[in-house]
């Protein structure tokens, strides 16, 4: 990778300047696509900010950009005007250029912000040169709010600054009035005034009457050293405009503005709702607007005025519907900074906000909300609720339109029916069960983002706190013991201080769950079970008769049990015990305790019993070590001798 270009950027004070290929140009020996030449901002600017023309200019600082985006002029540096005057300021950006597999290259971009530069959007080289409005035949003070050269002083090191001043030399005097300093008129023999006199409010313009034509004066400003000595330093020659207004003139009153809302890539007329003024003594055609700063999401155009952007228009253009905003592909909001004048009063700043609406929004639901059973609550995340349109909508607001039946939503521990995407992203929105009679719930929300809404249903399920056996296959035709090695809700018991209960909802398809008689004295056969407890599992009182799939050749099969698990003070949960089965294999060590094996296997072993043994298992079968796991079928027989 190599980096060409000047790596310096000259920026006018308070302006936006795009980075260009003259400033920053990366290339690689492999001729890499500029899209793949990636800059990472290691240290951002201190005097302004870097942002992307197509993205939110008010959002977070830019972190990455590509050489292609530099070529397109989409990477912008904006200088932010400081409160204190300056003549020249320097900023730096530290960047890292990367394009694997090449080694990264570090780069520093130097930014010079200077009043010396010729700036079309800031024609004056002074800190302020705003001009003056004066009523006809009257006087007005020219203060540093209108004319201020303190940025020239800022070029002097601060210890010596107090000994310096700025000398203004009037090179062309006002034609319709006169300038006075401390009530003394300026004239060709005495054409000077100082920045210090301006700052002290000693400069006055007195209008001579006889009309409201424009007036003004030209001047040259330069630094003056101690005792009035001329010193080398910045200087400028400029004009100061003086507008004379009719004494009876009432200034226009801007009216409250409603933001313009439109979808991206579309066009919308601007009406009086966006731009209007009350001015009884001016016609709409006399009220002029000028664009001081335009947003990046589109431009203003006049019907019949060509396709390009306009920077000047009148209230008459607005009132007649001739002015429109044309949105580009950007999806971010923006603001026009305008100045408005009736030609006789000082220009007033106005703004026009443009909000780019999504044509539609969608609530993305990636997964149901899973609530851990022992907690009974869970935080919502972007997995459950996230609004997207033409971009992600971080400002989305949600309102419950149908609440959950078995719980409620809380923010900060308080029940709530309204919350934001930000609160979801922060993990602050919690669903908590309040009624522990259902293993699932749902609620419906209405999402609102930038004036568009959409609804969605969030499903809630409870995740059982249950350890489920996940071993190898079980033998068809056998009865195996259901104990905590197969199903264990012991942790749920500890967490709730209760004995968890199971209810069989479904399955197995081939087989059944039975209660095993404790001893020979108990009445014979196994009883079918639909409900049991953790205690039953721990006591070894339960068996699972593993059936053979009917109507097909013997072979491996799959089966499952669906259970509902209940405990005190927590919602119930549905869990599955999925298991594989296979024809019984005497030589195979099964990892569960078998209470009986298929009849055919027993007959082969020379044990002429026709009934399935359902009595109490022998010591081996009931020990923690599974019986058949020890040594195949003979060991099983030994273990079950006494039954």
């Amino acid at each position: 990778l190599s980096l060409k270009g000047s790596q310096t950027l000259t920026v006018c004070p308070g302006s936006v300047q795009p980075l260009s290929s003259q400033t920053l140009r990366a290339s690689s020996s492999a001729g890499t696509d500029p899209q793949l030449l990636l800059y990472r901002v290691v240290r951002g600017p201190q005097l302004g900010r870097l942002f992307h023309a197509q993205q939110d200019s008010t959002g977070e600082a830019l972190v990455n950009f590509t050489q292609a985006e530099v070529y397109a002029g989409n990477i912008l540096y904006e200088h932010e005007m400081p409160p204190e005057p300056f003549w020249e300021a320097h900023d730096t950006l530290e960047l890292q250029l990367s394009s694997p597999p090449a080694r990264d290259v570090a780069a520093t971009l130097a930014v010079a912000v200077s009043f010396e530069a010729a700036c079309p959007q800031h024609p004056s080289h002074l800190w302020k040169n705003k001009g003056l409005w004066v009523p006809e035949g009257q006087r007005a003070r020219i203060t540093v709010a209108a004319l201020d050269a303190s940025n020239l002083l800022a070029s002097v090191p601060s210890p010596q600054r107090s000994e310096h001043d700025v000398l203004f030399q009037v090179t062309q005097f006002p034609s319709r009035g006169q300038l006075l300093v401390s009530e003394e008129p300026l004239h060709a023999g005495q054409p000077h005034f100082l920045q210090s006199q301006l700052a002290a409010g000693q400069l006055v313009y007195a209008h001579g009457g006889g009309g409201t034509q424009q007036d003004g004066f030209h001047f040259r400003a330069h630094l003056q050293g101690p005792a009035g000595a001329s010193v080398a330093g910045p200087q400028t020659s400029e004009a100061f405009a003086i507008t004379v207004r009719d004494v009876n003139e009432r200034p226009p009153q801007p009216q409250a503005s409603v933001p313009l809302r439109l979808t991206r890539g579309s066009r919308a007329p601007i009406s009086r709702a966006q731009l209007s003024v009350v001015d009884p003594d001016s016609a709409p055609g006399e009220i002029e607007y000028e664009v001081q700063r335009a947003p990046h999401n589109g431009f203003l155009s006049l019907v019949g005025g060509g396709l390009g952007p306009v920077t000047r228009f009148t209230q008459a253009d607005v009132d007649s519907g001739r002015l429109a905003f044309v949105a580009n592909g950007s999806s971010v909001a923006g603001i026009f900074q305008l100045s408005m004048s009736d030609g006789a009063s000082p220009p007033l700043p106005m703004s026009l906000a443009v909000d780019i609406l999504p044509s539609a929004i969608e609530v993305q639901l990636r997964a149901p909300l899973e609530v851990p059973q022992a907690l009974g609550r869970s935080s919502l995340s972007q997995q459950q609720l996230r609004v997207v349109s033409d971009r992600e909508e971080p400002e989305a607001a949600y309102r419950l339109i149908q609440g959950p039946q078995y719980g409620h939503l809380l923010v900060g521990g308080r029940p709530t029916s309204a919350f934001s995407q930000f609160q979801i992203d922060q993990g602050e929105v919690v669903f908590a069960f309040t009624n522990f009679s259902s293993s699932h719930d749902h609620f419906r929300v209405l999402a609102l983002a930038r004036g568009v809404n959409a609804s969605a249903v969030v499903n809630v399920t409870v995740r059982a706190l249950l350890h489920v056996w996940a071993g190898g296959p079980w033998p068809q035709g056998a009865t195996l013991r259901l104990d905590p090695t197969v199903l264990d809700a012991g942790e749920l018991a500890n967490r709730t201080g209760s004995v968890p209960r199971f209810r069989l909802l479904e399955g197995p398809r081939h087989g059944r769950v039975v209660r095993v008689p404790r001893a020979r004295t108990e009445p014979g056969g196994s009883q079918l079970v639909e409900q049991f407890t953790q205690q039953d599992l721990e006591d070894g009182r339960l068996g699972l008769e593993v059936g053979r799939p009917e109507g097909r050749a013997p072979g491996p099969a799959g089966d499952s049990l669906t259970l509902e698990l209940w405990a005190q003070g927590v919602p119930p949960a549905v869990a599955s015990l999925d298991f594989a089965t296979e024809p019984y294999n005497a030589a195979r060590p099964y990892s569960v305790a078998l209470l009986s094996v298929p009849e055919a296997a027993r007959t082969e072993a020379g044990k002429p019993e026709s009934s399935t043994p359902t009595g109490e298992p022998g010591p081996m079968a009931s020990s923690p070590e599974p019986a058949v796991a020890k040594g195949g079928f003979l060991s099983f027989l030994e273990a079950n001798m006494f039954s």
């Epitope: 907690l375 009974g376 609550r377 419950l400 339109i401 149908q402 609440g403 039946q405 409620h408 809380l410 900060g412 521990g413 308080r414 029940p415 709530t416 029916s417 309204a418 908590a432 069960f433 309040t434 009624n435 522990f436 709730t496 201080g497 005190q568 003070g569």
Partner: antibody, heavy 112, light 107 residues
């Protein structure tokens, strides 16, 4: 800040239906989550009667469920309590509340 | 139903004392606990919600703590206006239930 105000008769005859209304100001009953009725027998603790939510769904205390109905009128921003077949044991101060804020309470005496 | 048991049922204390009231739930309530203050003839006022969050406008001398089944309301330095009855209430499981109340009296 939400304010709640109970209204209704202070005396109800045994076996009749107690009816109270709560008027909410400073907030909408379609935006707050729970709108509760709670009562307090003289010199005793608090007993939750039931609630109606922002979307109109209800939940009642099982001990009173067969006799309680809570409804709402969104146009008036009010919610109401009806307790049927009252006895002297239903004599209490009845409060409406959203848990953050409570009405000042109204004493209902059941007596012939 | 979840039973809420407050202790003590009453206590006597002086201005400036540190006072602690406990509330025990018959089973875990996940922190969903409110504390209210009630003065004679008045409605209860929320002091603390979600175990330890101070309601707006409540003086910082009130604090709450606890988890699982055991919860505490502490008044760090009792003021004359704090003499009242205090109630705890759970909103973890329906029906919502209250403790029987603790009366704080002047010694």
């Amino acid at each position: 800040q939400v304010q709640l105000q109970e209204s209704g008769p202070g005396l109800v005859k045994p076996s009749q239906t107690l009816s109270l209304t709560c008027t909410v100001s400073g907030g909408s009953i379609t935006s707050g989550y729970y709108w509760n009725w709670i009562r307090q027998h003289p010199g005793k603790g608090l007993e939750w009667i039931g609630y109606i939510t922002y979307d109109g769904s209800n939940n009642y205390n099982p001990s009173l469920k067969s006799r309680v109905t809570i409804s709402r009128d969104t146009s008036k921003n009010q919610f109401s309590l009806k307790l049927s077949s009252v006895t002297a044991a239903d004599t209490a101060v009845y409060y409406c509340a959203d848990f953050d804020y409570w009405g000042q309470g109204t004493l209902v005496t059941v007596s012939s | 139903d979840i039973q809420m048991t407050q202790s003590p049922s009453s206590l006597s204390a002086s201005v400036g004392d540190r006072v602690t009231i406990t509330c025990r739930a018959s089973y875990g309530i996940r922190g969903y606990l409110n504390w209210y203050q009630q003065k004679p003839g008045k409605a209860p006022k929320l002091l603390i919600y979600y175990t330890s969050s101070l309601h707006s406008g409540v003086p910082s001398r009130f604090s709450g703590s606890g988890s699982g089944t055991d919860f505490t309301l502490t008044i760090s330095s009792l003021q004359p206006e704090d003499f009242a009855t205090y109630h705890c209430q759970q909103y973890s499981a329906l029906p919502w239930t209250f403790g029987q109340g603790t009366k704080v009296e002047i010694k």
